[in-house]
Interface confidence: low
């Protein structure tokens, strides 16, 4: 906290401009009116304030708006957003997509911070729903955000958003989430040819039903074992030995190393020994 001191004569700020970068912290505290700051927040980012000076400006806004900043101020926070704590952000009511975009832009290129996670939570609560525009914005900044949504929230994700998703963004998705995302991915990629389609759909196959796995087995896709191990057990069980052999192609030999793990273990137990023997891997049903 900055000690309360009177503003020196002639130093009272009439507007937020570059002259303020020469003010000491106590001078900013004493000479900048919080209401003036609030109405001219859009100028702050154009001025090379130090982090210490920004702390003072934040303190002034906190005093002016103890119940939380209005959206007119929030939209123009810019780099001052990086000074906010999740506790600060929980007081906000953010409803404008422009405000959300402006603040996500500040954090662009960085991982999702607790501040950003709280901001998004406040925004979604303020809007009352996850509409297409919101989801397009969030997936553009954080494709991995999909996996932090509940299956119910994911149901409103437009298939067009799926194109932004990279394989690593789905690493943390639960089976229930993939159950919702897979049909959307299938729809999004439906006009691609066989090999390109498989490359795109591969990450989502943890939500694929048996009939789609059977169809893939007819397309020489050569699924790797890592992908196979993430498939739904109930989707794998009805597959025949011949279908699994076609699905995995040259990777079928990897079944031996995974024979004690689901879904391979459960699948083996469902097969006739004669059929397993045709693989020549020594699998015991």
């Amino acid at each position: 906290e900055v000690e309360k001191t009177a503003c020196p004569s002639g130093k009272k700020a009439r507007e937020i401009d570059e002259s303020l970068i020469f003010y000491k912290k106590w001078e900013l505290e004493a000479c900048v009116d919080a209401a003036l700051l609030a109405t001219q927040m859009d100028r702050v980012n154009a001025i090379p304030f130090t982090y210490e000076q920004l702390d003072v400006l934040k303190h002034k806004l906190d005093e002016l708006y103890p119940q939380g900043y209005p959206e007119s101020v929030i939209q123009h926070l810019g780099y001052l957003f990086l000074k906010m704590s999740p506790e600060d952000i929980r007081k906000w009511n953010v409803t404008s997509l422009e405000t959300l975009k402006a603040l996500l832009e500040v954090n662009k290129g960085h991982e999702m911070s607790p501040q950003v996670a709280t901001l998004i939570d406040r925004f979604v609560k303020g809007r009352g729903q996850l509409d297409k525009d919101t989801l397009d914005t969030l997936t553009a900044f954080y494709p991995g955000y999909l996996c932090s949504l509940s299956p119910e929230e994911l149901s409103s994700v437009p298939p067009s958003s799926i194109w932004a998703v990279r394989p690593q963004d789905l690493d943390t998705c639960d089976p229930r989430q993939l159950d919702v995302l897979y049909p959307k991915a299938r729809l999004a990629f439906q006009n691609m040819n066989g090999s390109e389609y498989f490359v795109k759909i591969q990450s989502f196959l943890g939500g694929a039903p048996t009939e789609d796995l059977k169809a893939l087995s007819q397309q020489n896709v050569s699924m790797d074992l890592a992908t196979f191990m993430k498939l739904r057990t109930d989707a794998v069980l009805p597959l025949t030995v011949a279908e699994v052999q076609k699905l995995l192609g040259p990777h079928v030999e990897g079944l031996k190393a995974e024979e004690r793990h689901r879904p391979v273990r459960d699948w083996i137990l469902r097969q006739r020994q004669d059929d397993l023997d045709t693989l020549g891997l020594g699998l015991q049903g």
């Epitope: 996670a117 996996c147 932090s148 509940s150 929230e153 943390t172 998705c173 639960d174 989430q177 689901r262």
Partner: nanobody, 125 residues
Framework: QVQLVESGGGVVQPGGSLRLSCAAS????????VAWFRQAPGKGLEGVAA????????VYTDSVKGRFTISRDNSKNTLYLQMNSLRAEDTAVYYC??????????????????WGQGTTVTVSS
């Protein structure tokens, strides 16, 4: 009341190992997904590893795969993180978390209701 207490942090040289523990009390530990998160200096919170109550299908963030192992002992109400081949970029405050919100990803930072106070791991030569 629910309490999560982490321990096992410290200073270790690159390539070294540490084992973090998280002791839980005040909840039926065996029925909860539990996870490790970390926050490096000046960085955001990051999910490291998570283990569901079934103790199957553990999840790891890419940067620790093959080096870190998450495990749990339900009889002791304790979560562990075995960290091998430590690197400077593993330096962080490590937190355990539990009471996962239904439907959220196991490594989502907004996915847990209960958090520990953290234990500091410093990897430095």
């Amino acid at each position: 009341q629910v309490q999560l207490v982490e321990s096992g942090g410290g200073v270790v040289q690159p390539g070294g190992s540490l084992r973090l523990s998280c002791a839980a009390s005040g909840l039926s530990f065996s029925t909860y997904t539990v996870a490790w998160f970390r926050q490096a200096p000046g960085k955001g919170l990051e999910g490291v590893a998570a283990i569901p109550y079934t103790s199957q299908h553990m999840v790891y963030t890419d940067s620790v795969k093959g080096r870190f192992t998450i495990s749990r002992d339900n009889s002791k109400n304790t979560l562990y993180l075995q960290m091998n081949s430590l690197r400077a970029e593993d330096t962080a405050v490590y937190y355990c978390a539990t009471d996962r919100r239904p439907g959220t990803s196991m490594l989502a930072i907004n996915g847990y209701n209960r958090w520990g106070q953290g234990t500091t791991v410093t990897v430095s030569s």
